[in-house]
């Protein structure tokens, strides 16, 4: 009685259970009454990352420098190449097929999380008591200057974009 299901790492063909090819190898010939499955290693710049019955290996991903990409991890016969972005850029998707320049946080906003090769800058509005007067991909919101610690008084209130302006205390004369 021919099998209707096969063990793990096998596949059913022509009423026979054949061994799948191991990662890094492609299928040449299905097993037969006389022979085991025939597999061949993937070529240079090719890979297969699972037990498989593929007749063609997949091409390694190309990290195109024209798109701001560079190789983070070189592919093997069993793994794909992993791309990342050049310094100052980040991936537009999880697959990292292209890069965009890191976003800068506008005045009134500070950097909450600095960008990486795979994630953009995260900005946050400067809360009361903090400001940012530059457009930057690195600068956090800075605290307003404390006039009191300098024995000065606030002459102009700060905003989310400007620091306070301190000045000398008015001395009342008798």
């Amino acid at each position: 009685e021919p099998p209707t299901a096969c063990r793990e790492k096998q596949y059913l063909i022509n009423s026979q259970c054949c061994s799948l090819c191991q990662p890094g190898q492609k299928l040449v010939s299905d097993c037969t009454e006389f022979t085991e499955t025939e597999c061949l290693p993937c070529g240079e710049s090719e890979f297969l990352d699972t037990w498989n019955r593929e007749t063609h290996c997949h091409q390694h991903k190309y990290c195109d420098p024209n798109l701001g990409l560079r190789v983070q991890q070189k592919g093997t016969s069993e793994t794909d190449t992993i791309c990342t972005c050049e310094e100052g850029w980040h991936c537009t998707s999880e697959a990292c097929e292209s890069c965009v320049l890191h976003r800068s946080c506008s005045p009134g906003f500070g950097v909450k999380q600095i960008a990486t090769g795979v994630s953009d800058t995260i900005c946050e509005p400067c809360p009361v008591g903090f400001f940012s007067n530059v457009s930057s991909a690195f600068e956090k919101c800075h605290p307003w200057t404390s006039c009191e610690t300098k024995d000065l008084v606030v002459q102009q209130a700060g905003t989310n974009k400007t620091d306070v302006v301190c000045g000398p205390q008015d001395r009342l004369r008798a």
Epitope: N14, V28, S29, D30, E33, T35, E36, E38
Partner: antibody
């Protein structure tokens, strides 16, 4: 449908080289393996060697030194070449696909001067 | 090189009676994957060998169920439950586990 057909010289002189071609149809030689068997008159079959789908070859220990099996996938042909023939090489030569029971009709080769 | 030894060399059988042929291998025919590539062929007079049984016990398509194969490791048997006239010929065991592939010397079945 699957077919294999051998074409050989029929008569070969001792010490000469034998060339037989197996032309196949109904399948691709890049996906299937083919082996060669010979059977001398009144004797049992002898496995000679094979050409795997991936292009590698295996040979009988006793024939290895004078046997070459090759293929031309685009022409759907597997070739057998055997040198230094003697009368003991007189046999019917078959090419066979390595699955099911697909045999060529066989070609009789007689080695005689 | 692996040897396959068949017995008996000649097997006279009465029509309708059972027949049994033995094939012994000089080393185990179990492959690393667990398959055992031991096969049985029948060669009728004037014909090429025809596959009866593959991988010890699997009947090839179109082969009558009076033919059965069994065994493991190095000892294998072909059985015919009731011999018919068309079963006359030479039976060969063959292995494709180890390169070079080999054939047994043959068993000639004839009707008594």
């Amino acid at each position: 449908q699957v077919q294999l057909q051998e074409s050989g010289p029929g008569l070969v002189k001792p010490s000469e080289t034998l060339s037989i071609t197996c032309t196949v149809s109904g399948f691709s030689l890049s996906r299937y393996s083919v082996y060669w068997i010979r059977q001398p008159p009144g004797k049992g079959p002898e496995w000679m060697g094979m050409m795997w789908g991936g292009g590698s070859t295996d040979y009988s220990t006793s024939l290895k030194s004078r046997l070459t099996i090759s293929k031309d996938t685009s022409k759907s042909q597997v070739s057998l070449k055997m040198s230094s023939l003697t009368a003991a090489d007189t046999a019917v030569y078959y090419c066979v696909r390595t699955d099911g029971d697909y045999w060529g009709q066989g070609t009789l080769v007689t080695v005689s001067s | 090189e692996l040897q396959l030894t068949q017995s008996p060399l000649s097997l006279p059988v009465t029509l309708g009676q059972p027949a049994s042929i033995s094939c012994r291998s000089s080393q185990s025919l179990a492959s690393s994957s667990g398959n055992t590539y031991l096969h049985w062929y029948l060669q009728r007079p004037g014909q090429s060998p025809r596959l009866l049984i593959y991988k010890v016990s699997n009947r090839f398509s179109g082969v009558p169920d009076r033919f059965s194969g069994s065994g493991s490791g190095t000892d294998f048997t072909l059985k015919i439950s009731r011999v018919e006239a068309e079963d006359v010929g030479v039976y060969y065991c063959s292995q494709s586990t180890h390169v070079p592939w080999t054939f047994g010397g043959g068993t000639k079945l004839e009707i008594k």
